[in-house]
Amino acid sequence: MGCDRNCGLIAGAVIGAVLAVFGGILMPVGDMLIEKTIKREVVLEEGTTAFKNWVKTGTTVYRQFWIFDVQNPDDVAKNSSKIKVKQRGPYTYRVRYLAKENITQDPEDHTVSFVQPNGAIFEPSLSVGTEDDNFTVLNLAVAAAPHIYQNSFVQVVLNSLIKKSKSSMFQTRSLKELLWGYKDPFLSLVPYPISTTVGVFYPYNDTVDGVYKVFNGKDNISKVAIIESYKGKRNLSYWPSYCDMINGTDAASFPPFVEKSRTLRFFSSDICRSIYAVFGSEIDLKGIPVYRFVLPANAFASPLQNPDNHCFCTEKVISNNCTSYGVLDIGKCKEGKPVYISLPHFLHASPDVSEPIEGLHPNEDEHRTYLDVEPITGFTLQFAKRLQVNILVKPARKIEALKNLKRPYIVPILWLNETGTIGDEKAEMFKTQVTGKIKLLGMVEMALLGIGVVMFVAFMISYCACKSKNGK
């Protein structure tokens, strides 16, 4: 009878020990299994979860525009006054709804190449007005012409055309014209076959971005989605030195197992450069724990504040000998047009940049860019890309429309907020397939370990108690 009880207690302790050991073993084994599964599923090749979402994003992406409507155009042109602007928006378009095209796997170097078609569909229900709403904005062609043709003889010729076409420093254009293009009356007078269509994003619809060639991760998962080349080149040919490098991914995903200490590098063709994001905070996105990575102010700093940025300062006059910050001259990438990129409302820009403009209200929460990355898979499940398009306009003695200007202005034209968030259905699926399974496995591991340890300890205590009782 005593033996039966003792045997039973020992059996219970052994079972507990086995469960505890199994739970303990399951931890590294389970992690290994998860890692193996993740590594398999994030590879960019036919049949994987990542590939399906990569070819055509499951997220609805919107691009909202706010246009800076100039309130005092005549005063600026005549007296070189401060430019008073009032933002109007949002005007919302659906973008990135087209699947990647010309997808070609290269098994030799473990890459996949593709182009990303561009398209934009206006969403009236998410907009404050229609595409026919009018705005007073800088005359893009008039501002750009003397910058492209700094030759004084040609400026005299251009002045004749500007006067003949009755163009001036500012113009009134509809949203549709401003964004997607309009036939410019001044350029239409140039008696040579040049492109006479002007628009902030012209040409956009029916164009493609790329060719991109990215690592598929088959041989090395830590390189998955990292851009190997863009438009057939490993460099951009826009910037001197290392600033010209194409670093990281396209920000839609990153190699898996993202750590908070990691700097996420990515290339954005919109700003013609590679940039980076650093860990900001942990947030819960529809029940999925994600890391919010933010673009630091340091990325837009002057070379004085951040010496790494010295090669992004390509001209000395407007940048006050590279002391100004918060604006990026991307003219080299825009056929020599005087295009400057910044954060909305000149957030994180030096006071000299925003001083000639009235009506700007930079706000960290509304105007910063962030990426919400699920750390296990490296997928970006939510993002907000915010940037502002500005045009430099300078005094030009030979051009009457610009001859009264006493200083250069970096004139804000519009800012955009491109956002995407994983849908509820997709989030549920993601939780079931990824975070849910990981949570469940973690719970099983802890339960086995916990129950095993409790059983072992309880049965061992009972056994010892029984033994000492019998001994007496």
Epitope: N151, F153, V156, V157, S160, K163, K164, L189, P191, Y192
Partner: antibody, heavy 117, light 107 residues
């Protein structure tokens, strides 16, 4: 086909006047603007005057300023150079030429102006 | 005014020779330089604009180079029809100015 044909040259006494014409075909002179360039016998080329596109401003070499006037009749697609107070040093072959960006892609055959007593 | 100084003022060469004519601007004219060929009794003909851009119909043996203040016209292999006077011209600032010319003669 683009063509420029000058006329109106000849012998004139010092202090006299002459009006040169430049008839254009194959393009619209108002879109481009027209220049007059001269070449004294055995010498190099000298830019004389220019009328900017669309009846824009007129520009002259210092040596002819106040004496020469450039004009255009868009209905006739013809440019003119009115030369007053002519001097011996104005003796030259006068060419009209088309230009937009400042280089001359088409030239006329030239017309000789001789200023002599 | 911008002065354009051409050198040499004349040169003798044989058919098949490589000929180089230089032109110096008195101030920076970027790439706004044109080159012309003129034969006796004829109007000049445009060869090159924007310092390096070959005008349509001009044989590829003609080439231009340079930027800023120093410019060069090169004829890679001189042909019988190339014996003429060559002029450079800046089209950066009014008044437009020409070099004094370089006469290429048969050796």
């Amino acid at each position: 086909e683009v063509q420029l044909v000058e006329s109106g040259g000849g012998l004139v006494q010092p202090g006299g006047s002459l009006r040169l014409s430049c008839a254009a075909s194959g393009f619209t002179i108002s879109s481009f603007g027209i220049h007059w360039v001269r070449q004294a016998p055995g010498k190099g080329l000298e830019w004389v005057a220019w009328i900017a596109p669309y009846g824009g401003d007129e520009y002259y070499a210092d040596s002819v300023k106040g004496r020469f006037t450039i004009s255009a009749d868009t209905s006739k697609n013809t440019a003119y150079l009115q030369m007053n107070s002519l001097r011996a040093e104005d003796t030259a072959v006068y060419y009209c030429a088309r230009s937009f960006f400042g280089y001359f892609d088409y030239w006329g055959q030239g017309t000789l102006v001789t200023v002599s007593s | 005014d911008i002065q354009m100084t051409q050198s040499p003022s004349s040169l003798s060469a044989s058919v098949g020779d490589r000929v180089t004519i230089t032109c110096r601007a008195s101030q920076d004219v970027s790439n706004w330089v044109a080159w012309y060929q003129q034969k006796p009794g004829k109007a000049p003909k445009l060869l090159i604009s924007y310092a390096t851009s070959l005008y349509s119909g001009v044989p590829s043996r003609f080439s231009g180079s340079g930027s800023g203040t120093d410019f060069t016209l090169t004829i890679s292999s001189l042909q019988p029809e190339d014996f003429a006077t060559y002029y450079c011209q800046q089209h950066s600032n009014a008044p437009l100015t020409f070099g004094q010319g370089t006469k290429v003669e048969i050796k």
